[in-house]
Interface confidence: low
């Protein structure tokens, strides 16, 4: 099992966050998802900059809208339970960025679809993990 060092713990949490985001992307990109067209009409705010753990504040602020969009996707082919999923992501995000942070998120001018939003945060996790390893 992974060691208890702070770096290893951070890496594990980022891997879990990454996996959760990939789970959502897999679910909504599933060719059997009849709600995808409608889901793509929802707009998400993207961070102007996302290079450090404190920037996860921007993801945290978009978790409620993400849950609302995922609630649309409920069907027998969408196996993710939005409330459980978002709750888990929120716990990981809080642990990673720290709950005492006073960082104010700056958003880009352009909004994004759910797919673009998820891909942006997946890339964020991957890049941070790469620096840890």
């Amino acid at each position: 099992a992974p060691t208890s060092s702070s770096t290893k713990k951070t890496q594990l949490q980022l891997e879990h966050l990454l996996l959760d985001l990939q789970m959502i992307l897999n679910g909504i990109n599933n060719y059997k998802n009849p709600k995808l067209t409608r889901m793509l009409t929802f707009k998400f705010y993207m961070p102007k900059k996302a290079t450090e753990l404190k920037h996860l504040q921007c993801l945290e602020e978009e978790l409620k809208p993400l849950e609302e969009v995922l609630n649309l996707a409920q069907s027998k082919n969408f196996h993710l339970r939005p409330r459980d999923l978002i709750s888990n992501i929120n716990v990981i995000v809080l642990e990673l960025k720290g709950s005492e942070t006073t960082f104010m998120c700056e958003y880009a001018d352009e909004t994004a679809t759910i797919v673009e939003f998820l891909n942006r945060w997946i890339t964020f996790c991957q890049s941070i993990i790469s620096t840890l390893t």
Partner: antibody, heavy 113, light 107 residues
Framework: QVQLVQSGAEVKKPGASVKVSCKAS????????MHWVRQAPGQGLEWMGV????????TYAQKFQGRVTMTRDTSTSTVYMELSSLRSEDTAVYYC??????WGQGTLVTVSS | DIQMTQSPSSLSASVGDRVTITCRAS??????LAWYQQKPGKAPKLLIY???TLESGVPSRFSGSGSGTDFTLTISSLQPEDFATYYC?????????FGQGTKVEIK
């Protein structure tokens, strides 16, 4: 010690379903994602999907969408993988793996008429 | 899906030999590569993760290197217990995918 113990071998007829269990012990079951991987006789490893034992939600490889269901019982630290509409090409050893560093011993599922 | 291609598919070597197995990804996977060893009738065993980090308890004769699309597993001095099949695996992008395996046999 840290281990995953899987249920015993199964023989099924085409069209039937099989449910394989994987019981965790020696570590915090809910902390690590549980993957399922299968290996057909003489073949390589094929990822089927993953479940978050904490939240209970799962995602599956496209190939198995609609046929596989992964669930968990936190009270017994057990995850389950159910595969339906079995065909002969589903004959394989099915493994559970927690965090990739702990693997079950494998469960042979034979599909034959 | 990201394809993982291993080479060679099999090789014959003697105890004490230096053995190198390569794995190529169809697109960049950064350092998200792991190596597994599998013996007949047994579950795979994690050897290396994050390209080059040795799993606890794995002998130091095993090492991994590479980045992006090209990766290498090296066994510096092959031991009798190392004769097995080796798999690479990427977890950079879902779905997780494995190489087809490299069987290391006794010459």
């Amino acid at each position: 010690q840290v281990q995953l113990v899987q249920s015993g071998a199964e023989v099924k007829k085409p069209g039937a379903s099989v449910k394989v269990s994987c019981k965790a012990s020696g570590f915090t079951f809910t902390r690590y994602y549980m993957h399922w991987v299968r290996q057909a006789p003489g073949q390589g490893l094929e990822w089927m999907g993953v479940i978050n034992p904490s939240g209970g939600y799962a995602t599956y490889a496209q190939k198995f969408q609609g046929r596989v269901t992964m669930t968990r019982d936190t009270s017994t630290s057990t995850v389950y993988m159910e595969l339906s509409s079995l065909r002969s090409e589903d004959t394989a050893v099915y493994y559970c793996a927690s965090g990739w560093d702990v693997w079950g011993q494998g469960t042979l599922v034979t599909v034959s008429s | 899906d990201i394809q993982m291609t291993q080479s060679p598919s099999s090789l014959s070597a003697s105890v004490g030999d230096r053995v190198t197995i390569t794995c190529r990804a169809s697109q960049s996977i950064s350092s998200w590569l792991a190596w597994y060893q599998q013996k007949p009738g047994k579950a795979p065993k994690l050897l290396i993760y994050a390209t080059s980090t040795l799993e606890s308890g794995v002998p130091s004769r095993f090492s991994g290197s590479g980045s992006g699309t090209d990766f290498t597993l090296t066994i510096s001095s092959l031991q009798p217990e190392d004769f097995a099949t080796y798999y690479c695996q990427q977890s950079y992008s879902s779905p997780v995918t494995f190489g087809q395996g490299t069987k290391v046999e006794i010459k």
